[in-house]
Amino acid sequence: EPPTACREKQYLINSQCCSLCQPGQKLVSDCTEFTETECLPCSESEFLDTWNRETRCHQHKYCDPNLGLRVQQKGTSETDTICTCEEGLHCMSESCESCVPHRSCLPGFGVKQIATGVSDTICEPCPVGFFSNVSSAFEKCRPWTSCETKDLVVQQAGTNKTDVVCGPQDRQR
């Protein structure tokens, strides 16, 4: 009797269990009572990444330099191209279809995690004892200067945006 289900890597068509095409190949013709499934390799700029019965291969992703993209990994007949962003930029979304500049951490904030091609800068507020007086995508919060170690005294307290100001100790005469 004609099958109602087929084995793994097969598909049912016209009461026949036909072999699927392997990754990197597309379907040219279904199997028949007398012939195997016929498959053809995907062309240079195309791919299929699963066992399939697709009659067309998928086009490799284009890493558009106008959108700040560059090729991280070249596609093969079995894999898509992987794009990443140029230096100083990161992906706008998980699919990485375009890039945006890394965010800078404003004064009072330091870099907790430097941006990558796929993730933006993560900033954190400078805690007490630390400061950042620049807008930067790289600088962490820096500790206030320790006046004591320089044999100086605090003349002006530090904030999250400014360092302490040290001065000489008043000498008793």
Partner: antibody, heavy 112, light 112 residues
Framework: QVQLQESGPGLVKPSDTLSLTCAVS?????????WNWIRQPPGKGLEWMGY???????NYNPSLKNRITISVDTSKNQFSLKLSSVTAVDTAVYYC?????WGQGTLVTVSS | DVVLTQSPLSLPVTLGQPASISCRSS???????????LNWFQQRPGQSPRLLIY???NRFSGVPDRFSGSGSGTDFTLKISRVEAEDVGVYYC?????????FGQGTKLEIK
């Protein structure tokens, strides 16, 4: 329902070329399958001659050497057989077939 | 070329009795995908061949279930569980795993 129908002259002179056509209805020959020519000399068994594929490529029985050509006319949904330099041993019923479906066959006699 | 040898060449059977035809191949008919393209055809007197069994054991649509096929590699069998009057004719095996396709020489089934 797939149907195949052979047509062509029933008498061919020795050394001439035998030409037959197979008209297919109920299925487009460019979709899939191998489209075969098979012959059967009177009172004998079946002999596979060759096929043309849905994509126009073909394969022939080496026993027929360079005498055989199978071609396709997609506009008419038919395929044809040409067998050159025929002799009396080419006298047979000629069938066109998809193998699951066959024509009714046509007798070709080679005689002067 | 692959040679298919059928036995017996003549098979007299009593109505209602079983019948068995053997087809042996000169080389394995199993391809690299594990499929075996061995088919059985019936040719009634004065008619075109008719597909009974494809890929060793699959009955073609409309074929009575008294017909069954079995075997693997180089050894294949067609069985008729209970012969009926309409089963009279010649039975052929055909392999389409290797080009050129080849037929067995045929087994003539007749009623005793």
């Amino acid at each position: 329902q797939v149907q195949l129908q052979e047509s062509g002259p029933g008498l061919v002179k020795p050394s001439d070329t035998l030409s037959l056509t197979c008209a297919v209805s109920g299925y487009s020959i460019t979709t899939n399958y191998y489209w075969n020519w098979i012959r059967q000399p009177p009172g004998k068994g079946l002999e596979w001659m060759g096929y043309i594929k849905y994509d126009g490529s073909n394969n022939y029985n080496p026993s027929l050497k360079n005498r055989i050509t199978i071609s396709v006319d997609t506009s008419k949904n038919q395929f044809s057989l040409k067998l050159s330099s025929v002799t009396a041993v080419d006298t047979a019923v000629y069938y066109c077939a998809r193998l699951d479906y066959w024509g009714q066959g046509t007798l070709v006699t080679v005689s002067s | 070329d692959v040679v298919l040898t059928q036995s017996p060449l003549s098979l007299p059977v009593t109505l209602g009795q079983p019948a068995s035809i053997s087809c042996r191949s000169s080389q394995s008919l199993e391809n690299s995908n594990g499929n075996t393209f061995l088919n059985w055809f019936q040719q009634r007197p004065g008619q075109s061949p008719r597909l009974l069994i494809y890929k060793v054991s699959n009955r073609f649509s409309g074929v009575p279930d008294r017909f069954s096929g079995s075997g693997s590699g180089t050894d294949f069998t067609l069985k008729i569980s209970r012969v009926e009057a309409e089963d009279v004719g010649v039975y052929y095996c055909l392999q389409v795993t290797h080009v050129p396709f080849t037929f067995g020489q045929g087994t003539k089934l007749e009623i005793k």
